[in-house]
Interface confidence: low
């Protein structure tokens, strides 16, 4: 069964290569365990960037991923991806799975286009 997942269509990464965006879903029932996966779509291929499981007690996720972090609050996840470079510009999709208790629900957002601009190198200065 499907749930509606919403995320912003466009986000500009900071000059430090950090992009943050919310991923929200329409809760269908009280859920003890929510799995959130960030996927990057390039052409017809989906690549998993990071994934985590949130619970009522574990509201900070992606501890196994150095480039992802996120916090969970009811039906909203605030996602942050860091270490981004210009080559990482692309469409990032948020997938939400209501894992437990049943019934199982899944939903995928339409994706957030993250634009990353590499900072210009600082010119050497002779002082």
């Amino acid at each position: 069964e499907a749930i509606q997942v919403t995320q912003p269509s466009v986000v500009l990464a900071s000059s430090h290569g950090v992009a943050s965006f919310p991923c929200e879903y329409s809760p269908s029932h009280n859920t003890d365990e929510v799995r959130v996966t960030v996927l990057r779509q390039t052409n017809d291929q989906m690549t998993e960037v990071c994934a985590t499981t949130f619970t009522e007690k574990n509201t900070v996720g992606f501890l196994d991923y150095p480039f992802c972090s996120g916090t969970f609050n009811e039906s909203r996840v605030n996602l942050t991806i860091q270490g981004l470079r210009a080559v990482d510009t692309g469409l990032y999709l948020c997938k939400v799975e209501l894992m437990y208790p049943p019934p199982y629900f899944v939903g995928m957002g339409n994706g957030t286009q993250i634009y990353v601009i590499d900072p210009e190198p600082c010119p050497d200065s002779d002082f």
Partner: nanobody
Framework: QVQLVESGGGLAQPGGSLRLSCAAS????????VGWYRQTPGNQREWVAT????????TYADSVKGRFTISRDNAKNTIYLQMNSLKPEDTAVYYC??????WGRGTQVTVSS
């Protein structure tokens, strides 16, 4: 529409093993999580285990943790549930389910001596 067909059930003795299979047709299931559920004789349907899209991640109900193992073969479009150290209370009809499918017919597992 993805169709799921469960198989592999049967009669097992307490302490025995069974391996259930869940074959998908109509679409690939590699991009979705898949769960096993069971319906007990008392008509209570409960969650058993879930395999996430990256098959490295599995989640289990406390009642089966350490005894059951969920796995998937994306090339064969099939999900498995290896059931070891079976107990009489594991007797139920077992179903697999994804977010893309309706409930199938399930496969009956009976644990009895």
């Amino acid at each position: 529409q993805v169709q799921l067909v469960e198989s592999g059930g049967g009669l097992a003795q307490p302490g025995g093993s069974l391996r259930l299979s869940c074959a998908a047709s109509g679409s690939t299931i590699s991009s979705v999580a898949v769960g096993w559920y069971r319906q007990t004789p008392g008509n209570q349907r409960e969650w058993v285990a879930t395999s996430s899209t990256s098959s490295t991640t599995a989640t289990y109900a406390d009642s089966v943790k350490g005894r059951f193992t969920i796995s998937r073969d994306n090339a064969k479009n099939t999900i498995y549930l290896q059931m070891n150290s079976l107990k009489p209370e594991d007797t139920a009809v077992y179903y697999c389910k994804t977010g893309l499918t309706n409930w199938g017919r399930g496969t009956q597992v009976t644990v009895s001596s």
